[in-house]
């Protein structure tokens, strides 16, 4: 459940051993962009192990990745956003792997957040309102959103609603009442970008309030 | 297998500070977004701080400048600096790693005078 997923075209003859994913966060720090990179196995020895990008960077040829414990990671303005990168795992002046990336195609959105659910009693339902930090940037503006709500005693039945924007109302009579409900949402670049789903956003419970009886029963879901 | 397990927790006067703690195992640390949520006798659990993979942080407004989160990679774990306590900062605290069908035990925080 790390968010990534493969891409690209893996390359050389010891792929079993060093199979690797990434992924892109683009303007993650004002204007720096981000890529994370780590090993499918989490049991490689990454002792000697080093990353390296080349191709379709600004002004340099090639960029080195920093070591943070079992991931690799590069933050820097030099990404120029067309064509294909290759990224290789070397160990000294020796590639071990490489994949061909085209960094607009691993985006990984940041989460969204600031996830809150208020009641209309007037209109009996309920308004999920939420923030993505997308809205103010430059590239990944165009987002798809999966909000996923279910009832907190029903461990894996999560009901999922696909929305563009960051508002969405959920029917009172759709769901149970006098029951918590835990509620949470990610995004998936939907335009020019591709990519992966971002991680869920925290978690917001609300409780449903009980049934009106001069209102009638509340359709069950 | 996951496990997350948090520590720390006390009965401290309004105005005081605690640090709390939580030690992860079975996820890949590094690469996850890590949460801290509390849950007051009888409310609603709710979310009180975020730190990211990336290290950017998150609070929900009523601990803002009295909570500061933070992690360390090499240990996995996230702490949770708590200053500035308030009575209303009572509740069991539990780290988080984005799945919530995983929960620790919780830590209990009871600020009273």
């Known amino acids: 459940e790390s968010g990534y997923a493969q891409n690209g075209d893996l390359e050389d003859a010891e792929l079993d051993d060093y199979s690797f994913s990434c992924y892109s966060q683009l303007e993650v720090n004002g204007s720096q962009h981000s890529l994370t990179c780590a090993f499918e196995d989490p049991d490689v020895n990454i002792t000697n192990l080093e990353f390296e990008i080349c191709g379709a960077l600004v002004e340099v040829k090639c960029l080195n990745f920093r070591k943070l414990q079992e991931i690799y990671f590069i933050e820097t303005k030099k990404f120029l956003l067309i064509g294909k990168s290759n990224i290789c795992v070397k160990v000294g002046e020796k590639s071990l792997t490489c994949k061909k990336i085209d960094l607009t195609t691993i985006v990984k959105p940041e989460a969204p957040f600031d996830l809150s659910v208020v009641y209309r009693e007037g209109a009996n339902d309920f308004v999920v309102t939420f923030n993505t930090s997308h809205l103010q940037k430059k590239y990944v503006k165009v987002l798809m959103h999966d909000v996923a709500y279910r009832q907190e005693k029903d461990e894996n039945k999560w009901t999922h609603v696909n929305l563009s924007s960051t508002k969405l109302t959920l029917l009172q009579r759709k769901l149970q009442p006098a029951a918590m409900y835990e509620i949470k949402v990610r995004s998936i670049p939907d335009h020019y970008f591709k990519g992966f789903w971002s991680e869920w956003s925290p978690s917001y419970y609300f409780r449903t309030p009980e049934i009106n009886n001069s209102s009638g029963e509340m359709d069950p879901i | 297998q996951v496990q997350l397990v948090e520590s720390g927790g006390g009965l401290v006067r309004p105005g005081g500070s605690l640090r709390l703690a939580c030690a992860a195992s079975?996820?890949?640390?590094?690469?996850?977004?890590m949460h801290w949520y509390r849950q007051a006798s009888g409310r609603q659990r709710e979310w009180v701080a975020t730190i990211t993979a990336g290290g950017v942080t998150g609070y929900r407004d009523s601990v803002k400048g009295r909570f500061t989160i933070s992690r360390d990679n090499a240990k996995n774990t996230v702490d949770l600096q708590m200053n500035g306590l308030q009575l209303e900062d009572t509740a069991v605290y539990y780290c988080?790693?984005?799945?919530?069908?995983?929960w620790g035990q919780g830590t209990q925080v009871t600020v009273s005078s």
């Open positions: 079975g996820i890949r640390f590094s690469l996850r977004n």
């Open positions: 988080n790693h984005g799945d919530t069908a995983y």
